[in-house]
Interface confidence: medium
């Protein structure tokens, strides 16, 4: 399974999206970092 930062972040984004969560530029709900080099 893909467990790089990109994958983890995108999975979380999908979960928040499906649950009606809102993501703002100044709000980081979890750890993240190295997506596509």
């Amino acid at each position: 399974a893909c467990d790089t930062a990109t994958c983890v972040t995108h999975r979380l984004a999908g979960l928040l999206s499906r649950s009606g969560g809102v993501v703002k530029n100044n709000f980081v709900p979890t750890n993240v970092g190295s997506k596509a080099f």
Epitope: A5, C7, G33, S34
Partner: antibody, heavy 122, light 107 residues
Framework: EVQLVESGGGLVQPGGSLRLSCAAS????????ISWVRQAPGKGLEWVAE??????????HYAEAVKGRFTISRDNAKNSLYLQMNSLRAEDTAVYYC?????????????WGQGTLVTVSS | EIVLTQSPATLSLSPGERATLSCKAS??????VSWYQQKPGQAPRLLIY???NRYLGIPARFSGSGSGTDFTLTISSLEPEDFAVYYC?????????FGQGTKLEIK
């Protein structure tokens, strides 16, 4: 303003050790996964290591070429990233960059430091 | 390890021309590919992420496409400041890998 500033590079003999630092500012350092990337003189880019966030127990990943010789670590209280390099070889000669990448919907962020040069030579 | 192969190694074009750079992955990487521009003495600059998304402040003449294993960076009309080295990179699997680079030079 986000800033990443590397330091600690220099000339070291083969078999020697060096510790690189990356001072971060302008963001909540402990929340982010962060990496070291290197570039040998006149060559391409090579990922070295990554450390995850505090909430991920600062788990680490390494390139095969450095596994067992290099250790990535972080001090969230000091907003600093480190790379302890042991048993250095000539092929480790490179500019070392710390790099932050965050992709979360609209919150796309990509930052690199200016790099610090490590030269391994006798 | 996922190997990224860029072509051509060198591309010689004139300002105003269209540049097409290719990146092929040895394994499927969905759209987890980025493109970077690097000039001598500088850190890489992110141009495209997620195969086709332009990063903040990147001019519209830069565009990316592809998915799976084949990816393309297109510069629609070259400006003098575009002559540099371009790298593709994947973040689908560890270790993160880069292509060997394409040098875009003035003809």
């Amino acid at each position: 303003e986000v800033q990443l500033v590397e330091s600690g590079g220099g000339l070291v003999q083969p078999g020697g050790s060096l510790r690189l630092s990356c001072a971060a500012s302008g963001f909540t350092f402990s929340n982010y996964w962060i990496s070291w990337v290197r570039q040998a003189p006149g060559k391409g880019l090579e990922w070295v290591a990554e450390i995850r966030s505090e909430s991920d127990a600062s788990a680490t990943h390494y390139a095969e070429a450095v596994k067992g010789r290099f250790t990535i670590s972080r001090d969230n209280a000091k907003n600093s990233l480190y790379l302890q390099m042991n048993s250095l070889r000539a092929e480790d000669t490179a500019v070392y960059y710390c790099r932050l990448y965050f992709d979360y919907g609209l919150a796309i962020q990509n930052y690199w430091g200016q790099g610090t040069l490590v030269t391994v030579s006798s | 390890e996922i190997v990224l192969t860029q072509s051509p190694a060198t591309l010689s074009l004139s300002p105003g021309e269209r540049a097409t750079l290719s990146c092929k992955a040895s394994k499927w990487v969905t759209t987890y590919v980025s493109w970077y521009q690097q000039k001598p003495g500088q850190a890489p600059r992110l141009l495209i992420y997620g195969a086709s998304n332009r990063y903040l402040g990147i001019p519209a003449r830069f565009s990316g496409s592809g998915s799976g294993t084949d990816f393309t960076l297109t510069i629609s009309s070259l400006e003098p400041e575009d002559f540099a080295v371009y790298y593709c990179s994947q973040s689908y699997n560890y270790p993160y890998t880069f292509g060997q680079g394409t040098k875009l030079e003035i003809k």
